[in-house]
């Protein structure tokens, strides 16, 4: 799996999208989990509605919400009031029985608010100093990193 980097700004909301094949994952609930260590488990943060037909309903755990467009094949996770400790390595998962398939590996980065300047010095724009030349900028900056592009820490 490639890893997609999503950057958000402290105090703001960050929306993470995980596209998937709606036919392949038909009838499956989804989940958002956080990888706790290089070799550690992926700890469940929030999952979609227990009834798959109601997956479009937003479910929340603290400041994290999840909703699933099962027809369009897009799982959406919203992190509200982003804080530095929200930074981390996450996964979107498709659940079947006690198993879970990884839909997308996600790296969340939380940046300092660039607009919170007390002096009107050098205006800093998100992504300006980052190595995200092909970044897609919306409310967040996201970029897919190819497996071989940067060596990822081994997970086994």
């Amino acid at each position: 799996h490639n890893t997609t980097v999503f950057q958000g700004v402290e105090g703001q909301s960050l929306q993470v999208s995980c596209p998937y094949d709606s036919m392949k994952h038909w009838g499956r609930r989804k989940a958002w989990c956080r990888q706790l260590g290089e070799k550690g488990p992926c700890q469940r943060v929030v999952s979609t509605h227990n009834l798959w037909l109601l997956s479009f309903l937003r479910r929340r755990n603290g400041s994290t919400a999840i909703t699933d467009d099962t027809l369009g094949g897009t799982l959406t996770i919203t992190l509200r009031n982003l804080q530095p400790h929200d930074a981390g390595f996450y996964q979107c998962q498709s659940l079947h029985g006690s198993e879970a398939d990884t839909l997308r590996k996600v790296l969340v980065e939380v940046l300092a608010d660039p607009l919170d300047h007390r002096d009107a010095g050098d205006l800093w724009v998100p992504g300006e100093s980052e190595s995200f030349e092909d970044a897609h900028v919306e409310h967040s900056i996201s970029r897919s990193l190819l497996e071989g592009e940067i060596p990822f820490p081994p997970t086994s």
Epitope: Q35, P84, F89, E130, I150
Partner: antibody, heavy 121, light 107 residues
Framework: QVQLVQSGAEVKKPGASVKVSCKAS????????IHWVRQAPGLGLEWMGW????????TSAQKFQGRVTMTRDTSISSAYMELSRLRSDDTAVYYC??????????????WGQGTTVTVSS | DIQMTQSPSSLSASVGDRVTITCRAS??????LAWFQQKPGKAPKSLIY???SLQSGVPSKFSGSGSGTDFTLTISSLQPEDFATYYC?????????FGPGTKVDIK
């Protein structure tokens, strides 16, 4: 064991730039953020910012934005901090420190030995 | 920015003493607090993270407690190698800020 080794002392003139390096060993470099912290003579510690070696993403304290550039070279497990438009009050010991969280911000656990930067005309 | 204050700013103690240093944040930081020890001419050494978790290799005579705005670092029985300056740091909100330090010296 986990180790961060920094480059040697530097003497710079006001207006110049300085680039400090931090070479990591003993762990997977791309799995842990690197923070930069400085300490002026006789004073306390001041956080400058971090770089995520996996993605190259950075953030910095507002007082340094536009003047600090943090980069990394994953092929040699090294992080760099460049500070431009140096002033005399930038004279300090500059430290790199590894965050203990896996691609996360959980507080630093290992520090480099420090690099003394003196800014003087 | 979150201001971190430490008290006392300095203290004199004897070997074997129990020493307590307090750190206060200007706003709530949950448990996102770390403690460091620094000796003259040396880099800081990480002692505690998440307010009360001991870093690997740090002796159990060091302990941390607190949550929200008030935190303490306790050294249960001061040893000669513990005379140093101690700093707290919050990593809840940018910019991550340090306390001004508490210098522990020999009585």
């Amino acid at each position: 064991q986990v180790q961060l080794v920094q480059s040697g002392a530097e003497v710079k003139k006001p207006g110049a730039s300085v680039k400090v390096s931090c070479k990591a060993s003993g762990y997977t470099f791309t799995g842990y953020y690197i923070h930069w912290v400085r300490q002026a003579p006789g004073l306390g510690l001041e956080w400058m910012g971090w770089i995520n070696p996996y993605s190259g993403g950075t953030t910095s304290a507002q007082k340094f934005q536009g003047r600090v550039t943090m980069t990394r070279d994953t092929s040699i497990s090294s992080a760099y901090m460049e500070l431009s438009r140096l002033r005399s009050d930038d004279t300090a010991v500059y430290y790199c420190a590894r965050d203990g969280g896996y691609l996360a911000l959980y507080g630093t656990d290992v520090w480099g030995q420090g690099t003394t930067v003196t800014v003087s005309s | 920015d979150i201001q971190m204050t430490q008290s006392p700013s300095s203290l004199s103690a004897s070997v074997g003493d129990r020493v307590t240093i307090t750190c206060r944040a200007s706003q709530g930081i949950s448990n996102y607090l770390a403690w460091f020890q620094q000796k003259p001419g040396k880099a800081p050494k990480s002692l505690i993270y998440a307010a009360s978790s001991l870093q690997s290799g740090v002796p159990s005579k060091f302990s941390g407690s607190g949550s929200g705005t008030d935190f303490t670092l306790t050294i249960s029985s001061l040893q000669p190698e513990d005379f140093a300056t101690y700093y707290c740091q919050q990593y809840s909100t940018y910019p991550f800020t340090f306390g001004p330090g508490t210098k522990v010296d020999i009585k």
